[in-house]
């Protein structure tokens, strides 16, 4: 056997090159046949009525033909025949790769609620061979379940992803990425998750700035509630008691002027949206007003100052410790 061919893999629509090569040529006729065993080329003559076949080279040792605009129907065995005695035949297999025609992502629900499991489907249509589908949530790869449907040598792949959503997933892209030998680079489609979640409530003390509440001072608390959809109701209540008469409520803000010991207690900010409600508590402890010490005499300056300073530090630090963790979110 001194007739040689090489298999060809080509992407649909591109050009395939078929070569029949002869070692130790004796000027015998070379003929190229298609998978239906019809003659494409007889020597350098093309009897076949398919002008997509063009002669690239013809000699006693080679018949080289190009096939342009390759389609899936061109796939198969192409036979090189050498008119020797006995006749020689060799075949080359043309494999046609078809990239997926369409990539569609479909989310079961446009808007999901945190904790809910949603179904996301991605379909890569009419490819050959079957497409591999990979899933990503942001940069994190997830595992889907693929089903392959074959029709007329083409494959449609549908991959299903079951995704339990969290509030952190809101605005994060779910990416369906295709891997296929006919596709270079990244072929992907994505949908952004929209996740509704109940409010997250956080209380901020905006006054006094140093965080120590004393009798006679004012207190201003701001309730920050973040949720999706944005909370419609933000309310302040005093747990197990009435709100002080001199408390002023203004939207998310709570003002209490001229604090006194009777204001001690737990103040709760409640926020709700269609998903649910949440609250955060602030425990108010009103401290004594600061002690006023007369100016020390010259002889006891150092000691008094030292003592006073020490006392002040002790008092303030104790007060600071008790007042330092007073807001509890729920």
């Amino acid at each position: 056997q001194n007739l040689f061919t090489k298999d060809v893999t080509v992407i649909e629509g591109e050009v395939a090159t078929i070569s029949c090569q002869v070692n130790k040529s004796d000027d015998s006729v070379i003929q190229l046949l298609n998978p239906n065993r019809q003659t494409i080329y007889f020597r350098d003559f093309r009897p076949l009525k398919d002008s997509r076949f063009q002669l690239l080279n013809f000699s006693s040792s080679e018949l080289k033909v190009s096939l342009t605009n390759v389609s899936i129907s061109d796939e198969g065995r192409y036979f090189c025949q050498l008119y020797t005695d006995p006749p020689q035949e060799s075949y080359t297999t043309i494999t046609v790769l078809v990239p997926p025609r369409n990539l569609m992502i479909d989310i079961q629900k446009d808007t999901a609620v945190e904790g809910e499991e949603i179904e996301v489907n991605c379909t890569a249509m009419a490819s050959k061979p079957a497409t591999t589908i990979r899933w990503f949530k942001g940069n994190t790869e997830l595992k889907g379940k693929s089903e392959v449907e074959e029709w007329s040598d083409m494959y449609t792949v549908t991959s299903q992803l079951m995704l339990k959503v969290h509030k952190e997933d809101d605005g994060v892209p779910v990416i369906c990425q295709v891997e296929h030998p006919a596709v270079t680079g990244n072929l992907q489609t994505q949908r952004y998750l929209e996740v509704q979640y109940k409010p997250q409530v956080h209380i901020q003390m905006t006054y006094p700035l140093q965080g120590l509440t004393r009798e006679g001072d004012a207190l201003e608390l701001t309730c920050e509630a973040i949720g999706k959809p944005q909370p419609v109701m933000v309310t302040w209540v005093r747990v197990d008691d009435e709100m002080p008469q001199h408390a002023v409520l203004s939207g998310p803000n709570l003002f209490i002027n001229n604090l006194n010991k009777t204001d001690n207690g737990t103040y709760r900010c409640e926020a709700s949206n269609i998903v649910g409600k949440a609250h955060s508590d602030y425990m108010l402890y009103v401290y004594d007003p600061p002690t006023t010490i007369p100016p020390p005499t010259t002889t006891t300056t150092t000691t008094t100052t030292t003592t006073t300073t020490i006392l002040t530090i002790i008092t303030d630090s104790r007060a600071g410790e008790e007042g330092s963790i007073r807001a509890v979110d729920h």
Epitope: D27, S28, V29, L33, N36, R37, Q38, T39, F42, R43, F45, R46, P47, L48, K49, S51, Y83, T84, D85, P86, P87
Partner: antibody, heavy 111, light 108 residues
Framework: EVQLLESGGGLVQPGGSLRLSCAAS????????MSWVRQAPGKGLEWVSS????????SYADSVKGRFTISRDNSKNTLYLQMNSLRAEDTAVYYC?????????WGRGTL | QYELTQDPAVSVALGQTVRITCQGH??????ATWYQQKPGQAPVLVMY???NRPSGIPDRFSGSSSGNTASLTITGAQAEDEADYYC???????????FGGGTNLTVL
């Protein structure tokens, strides 16, 4: 000069045999498929048989299969057609033709 | 049985254009080849492939093909073009050749 010259035709009884020859000159005979085509009096052309350049493959029209044998001797640049079990309907002018897929050279024919 | 069909006879006025047609299943795949035969002579190749004329054949001869029909057109027919015209092709295997029944062209 490029030419083909047939010989061997004649009158034969039904059931008889005849051997036709075709001498080629002016081209490299061993490189070409050769064929026999016949034409009955007042009728059209009818392909009879073909043989590859190497002699490695032959093909026949259904009407002559099993009765006619095509052969060649590349060293003598000669094509043959052995006709056995002849019938009245085999009466025709027999042309030998050089084939390049199409018949680009014909002999004058032998009856 | 594989066949090629031709009109038995066609006539054309001198200098006019005439089209000779050939129909057959394999002409969907293969180009037809056309031969001219004058009385008492061997056939002569006049057209092959897509539209190829051998040397010595006048350029008034042209070939075309559509679907299962092949055509030989003579543009400006001359008296010497009066002859029988045969189309020829192969079965789909390429192994068996077949001729049309022939068309007798008369130039008036």
């Amino acid at each position: 000069e490029v030419q083909l010259l047939e010989s061997g035709g004649g009158l034969v009884q039904p059931g008889g045999s005849l051997r036709l020859s075709c001498a080629a000159s002016g081209f490299t005979f061993s490189m070409y498929t050769m064929s026999w085509v016949r034409q009955a009096p007042g009728k059209g052309l009818e392909w009879v048989s073909s043989i590859w350049s190497s002699g490695g493959k032959t093909s026949y029209a259904d009407s002559v299969k099993g009765r006619f044998t095509i052969s060649r001797d590349n060293s003598k640049n000669t094509l043959y057609l052995q006709m056995n079990s002849l019938r009245a309907e085999d009466t025709a002018v027999y042309y030998c033709a050089k084939e390049s897929w199409y018949f680009d050279l014909w002999g004058r024919g032998t009856l | 049985q594989y066949e090629l069909t031709q009109d038995p006879a066609v006539s054309v006025a001198l200098g006019q254009t005439v089209r000779i047609t050939c129909q057959g299943h394999s002409l969907r795949s293969y180009y037809a080849t056309w031969y001219q035969q004058k009385p008492g002579q061997a056939p002569v190749l006049v057209m092959y492939g897509e539209n190829n004329r051998p040397s010595g054949i006048p350029d008034r001869f042209s070939g075309s093909s559509s679907g299962n029909t092949a055509s030989l057109t003579i543009t400006g027919a001359q008296a010497e073009d009066e002859a029988d015209y045969y189309c020829n092709s192969r079965d789909n295997s390429g192994n068996h050749l077949v001729f049309g029944g022939g068309t007798n062209l008369t130039v008036l």
